[in-house]
């Protein structure tokens, strides 16, 4: 006999990276017929929603109107059908950005490279941080973590045309409080692929959210819960 229901999906809209003082909605999708959803923050009950009518609703939204560092952290949700509770969702890491300062991002040997060359990004931030994150825009982007007193190195490659794109970096004051994004660096990769290794398999996060962090019009993005979920769960591990 089944003791628990399948775990729900959890994700953030428009994005799990939220500029301070901006709004964000945490979504939890369970099953039709669920009479109660609970949102947990850092292991404690944070909010409850009871959809009406439950048989017509399989998703609830928890609205945060004003993002700040106190609201940043790990969220999970569960739902109940009758007396039976679900497994908890995966953890959603909700990150507050645009805190304090702006890092600078540079790329060596330069922004225009030839396929097969090795590339290193350097992210620098003079304020008190020791963790840095390099993110590439786009649906199948890459996230790298680096450490250093005021700057971190992010080796890439040998590059292929798959590495083309726009990169930004953040300084991280803690796992869930990030700096402003750096100015973008656009990496251009030209030439044939000559015995190069494939791009590294890093966690992905969905499409273009820079500047205003608004959701793009890409179809199906809001339904791509597993991708959001996977990113939020793995980005900071």
């Amino acid at each position: 006999q089944q003791q628990t229901l399948p775990k729900p999906f959890i994700w953030a809209e428009p994005h799990f990276m939220v500029p301070k003082e901006k709004q964000v909605t945490i979504c939890c999708q369970g099953n039709y017929g669920a009479v109660e959803y609970q949102l947990h923050f850092e292991g404690s009950l944070f909010a409850v929603d009871r959809p009406k009518p439950p048989e017509r609703i399989n998703k609830v939204q928890f609205y945060i109107p004003d993002m700040n560092s106190r609201m940043a952290g790990q969220y999970s949700c569960i739902y109940r059908v009758g007396e039976l509770w679900s497994e908890p969702s995966n953890l959603l890491d909700l990150v507050v950005t645009e805190m304090y300062d702006t890092p600078t991002l540079s790329v060596h040997p330069g922004p225009e490279v030839i396929s097969g060359e090795k590339v290193t990004f350097y992210c620098r931030l003079d304020t008190a941080t020791s963790m840095f994150l390099l993110l590439k825009e786009g649906r199948s982007s890459h996230v790298q973590r680096g450490y250093g007193k005021v700057q971190a190195e992010f080796p890439l490659g040998p590059v292929t045309t798959a590495h083309r794109g726009t990169y930004r970096c953040f300084g991280s004051y803690n796992n869930h409080a990030w700096s402003f994004p750096s100015e973008p660096v656009k990496l251009l990769v030209t030439g044939d692929i000559e015995n190069t290794s494939l791009a590294p398999e890093d966690p992905t996060f969905p499409a273009d959210t820079w500047g205003t962090y608004l959701l793009t019009t890409e179809t199906g993005l809001q339904k791509d819960h597993a991708l959001w979920d996977h990113t939020a769960q793995n980005l900071l591990r």
């Epitope: 600078t104 991002l105 540079s106 060596h108 040997p109 330069g110 030839i114 396929s115 097969g116 060359e117 090795k118 290193t120 350097y122 620098r124 700057q151 190195e153 080796p155 490659g157 040998p158 590059v159 030439g191 000559e194 190069t196």
Partner: antibody
């Protein structure tokens, strides 16, 4: 065209410091890495470190971290390398070289450490 | 630190001869390799970047290639001004490192 101007020579006392200059022209100074390279008489080339003038990002070879300090003055498009606590081992020609791929080289400054 | 082992350290050859210099990388450097030429007065000039791309103004007799971790500079027909020093340089990973150099001498 790209030019990197370095003084021909510097004579310094042991234990003193020296600040070498490299004046850049013919390109956007803040958009390219500037590397520094050492060559002792009759020896090969050794990379010291690099600086990105647009952001002051620096990167040093571990063995030069306590010896060399790289800085830039973007208003005059000049890169500097300060060498401290000089000994006879620091007597060498020092080159500045532009771009992540070491595309253009200065003529080098001969530093002689002598009492 | 990536070691660049350059060979030979010196080479005697005749005008018009074809010669090859080699650098072996101790770790993967992709195509991030330069060949540099140094004149007796100390002037340094880049000949080849990214393993095989020829710098503008460099004669076509110079070419670069790669086979696995071995990188080669070939001069197809030696001219008198080619009898100088040559260095390879990897810029894949810091600290960036040079080969020990090759002194090309006229036979």
């Amino acid at each position: 065209q790209v030019q990197l101007q370095q003084p021909g020579s510097e004579l310094v006392r042991p234990g003193a410091s020296v600040k070498l200059s490299c004046k850049a022209s013919g390109y956007t100074f803040t958009s390219y890495w500037m590397h520094w390279v050492k060559q002792r008489p009759g020896q090969g080339l050794e990379w010291i470190g690099t600086i990105y003038p647009g952001s002051d990002i620096t990167n040093y070879d571990e063995k030069f971290k306590n010896k060399a300090t790289l800085t830039v003055d973007t208003s005059s498009s000049t890169a500097y390398m300060q060498l401290s606590s000089l000994t006879s081992e620091d007597s060498a020609v020092y080159y500045c070289t532009r771009d992540g791929r070491f595309a253009n080289w200065g003529q080098g400054t001969l530093v002689t450490v002598s009492a | 630190e990536i070691q660049m082992t350059q060979s030979p350290s010196s080479l005697s050859a005749s005008l018009g001869e074809r010669v090859s210099l080699t650098c072996r990388a101790s770790q993967d450097i992709g195509s991030s390799l330069n060949w540099l030429q140094q004149e007796p007065d100390g002037t340094i000039k880049r000949l080849i970047y990214a393993t095989s791309s020829l710098d503008s103004g460099v004669p076509k007799r110079f070419s670069g290639s790669r086979s696995g971790s071995d990188y080669s500079l070939t001069i197809s027909s030696l001219e008198s001004e080619d009898f100088v020093d040559y260095y390879c340089l990897q810029y894949a990973s810091s600290p960036y490192t040079f080969g020990g150099g090759t002194k090309l001498e006229i036979k």
